[in-house]
C-alpha cells in the first residue's frame, strides 16, 4: 500500500531493488529473487476454482503506480500490496482477499465445505 503523502508520479529510485518472487519470476531472476526499478509486490487472488493463490515479485516503475493502487475488478477477488523500503520487503506483505459481496454469492462458483 502507498505511504501517506507519497506522490502519484513515480520517481526513479537511485538504485535497483531486489524482491522475492514466487509464481512470478522473470527470466532474469536468480534463486527466486528479481530486480526492479520500481516496487516489490505480493498479491492474493482466487483461481478459477475459487482457491486463493499468492504470487509475489517485481513491478517495474512504469505502470506500477496503477498496478499497486489495487482498484477493485468486478467479479474478481484480488488484493495487492507493494513496498520499496528495503530489499525483499515483500516477504513481509500479507494481503488478504476482499470479503465476498452478496452478488458474488449469486454469480460466483458454489463452494462446498
Amino acid at each position: 500500500k502507498k505511504e501517506d503523502g507519497e506522490s502519484t508520479a513515480p520517481t526513479p529510485r537511485p538504485k535497483i531493488l531486489r524482491c522475492k518472487c514466487h509464481h512470478h519470476c522473470p527470466e532474469d531472476s536468480v534463486n527466486n529473487i528479481c530486480s526492479t526499478d520500481g516496487y516489490c509486490f505480493t498479491m492474493i487472488e482466487e483461481d478459477d476454482s475459487g482457491m486463493p493463490v499468492v504470487t509475489s515479485g517485481c513491478l517495474g516503475l512504469e505502470g506500477s503506480d496503477f498496478q499497486c493502487r489495487d482498484t477493485p475488478i468486478p467479479h474478481q477477488r484480488r488484493s495487492i500490496e507493494c513496498c520499496t523500503e528495503r530489499n525483499e520487503c515483500n516477504k513481509d506483505l500479507h494481503p488478504t482477499l476482499p470479503p465476498l459481496k452478496n452478488r458474488d454469492f449469486v454469480d460466483g462458483p458454489i463452494h462446498h465445505k
Epitope: I16, P26, D28, V30, S35, E88
Partner: antibody
Framework: QVQLQQPGAELVKPGASVKLSCKAS????????MQWVKQRPGQGLEWIGE????????LYNQKFKGKATLTVDTSSSTAYMQLSSLTSEDSAVYFC?????????WGQGTTLTVSS | DVVMTQTPLSLPVSLGDQASISCRSS???????????LHWYLQKPGQSPKLLIY???NRFSGVPDRFSGSGSGTDFTLKISRVEAEDLGVYFC?????????FGSGTKLEIK
Amino acid sequence: QVQLQQPGAELVKPGASVKLSCKASGYTFTSYWMQWVKQRPGQGLEWIGEIDPSDSYTLYNQKFKGKATLTVDTSSSTAYMQLSSLTSEDSAVYFCARFGYYIEYWGQGTTLTVSS
Amino acid sequence: DVVMTQTPLSLPVSLGDQASISCRSSQSLVHSTGNTYLHWYLQKPGQSPKLLIYKVSNRFSGVPDRFSGSGSGTDFTLKISRVEAEDLGVYFCSQSTHVPFTFGSGTKLEIK
C-alpha cells in the same frame, strides 16, 4: 564529488584472512549499492558481489561464496570485504564501486599480495 | 553466467581515426523492466575503470560526445568518432541485467 578511498596495498600470508576497506564520501552512503570487483593481470574483471548499505542485504557471485564476506559500517560510510583462507589465486587488485543500476564510480583499488 | 565476448582484443588506430569495438552477450540483456543494462568503461594503465556509456547509449557526465554506444538484445557497439591520445587504454563492456554481473575481456586501443 564522489570518492571511494581504498588502501593501496596489503601483504598477507597464505591461509590467513584479510579485511579490505572502502571509505565512501561525497554522497549518501545508504542510497547506493557497493560492489566489489576482482582484477588479475590477464584475467579481466570479475564481479564478487554487492551489499546494500541501507539494510546490509548482500548478493554474491556463487564463485566467491565462502571466500568473500561483505559488510558495512554506516556510521563511518565504510564498506568492507573479508577474504578468507587466502591462496596465491587471491592475489589481485580489488576494487570497490558505487552501483545504482550500473557501476558509476570505482575506488582506486587495493593490490592484495598473498605470499609467505 | 552471461559470457561477454569483445572484439577485437587489440585495436591499433591513428589519432583522428574512427574506432569501433563490438560486444556480444551469450543471452539477451533486456531486463524484465524493459531496460537494457549494457555499459562501457575505459581503464587507463594503473587506474581504475571509468564509466563512459550506460544503458547501451547514454553518455555519462563529462564524457565527450565523440563516444557513442548502440545496439540491442545481444549485440552492442562502442564508437569513438575521432580518437585522441587521451582515449588510449583498455575498453570493457559490462552487463548488470543478470546476476552474476559480468565483463568483457577488454579491447586495448593503441596507436598504430
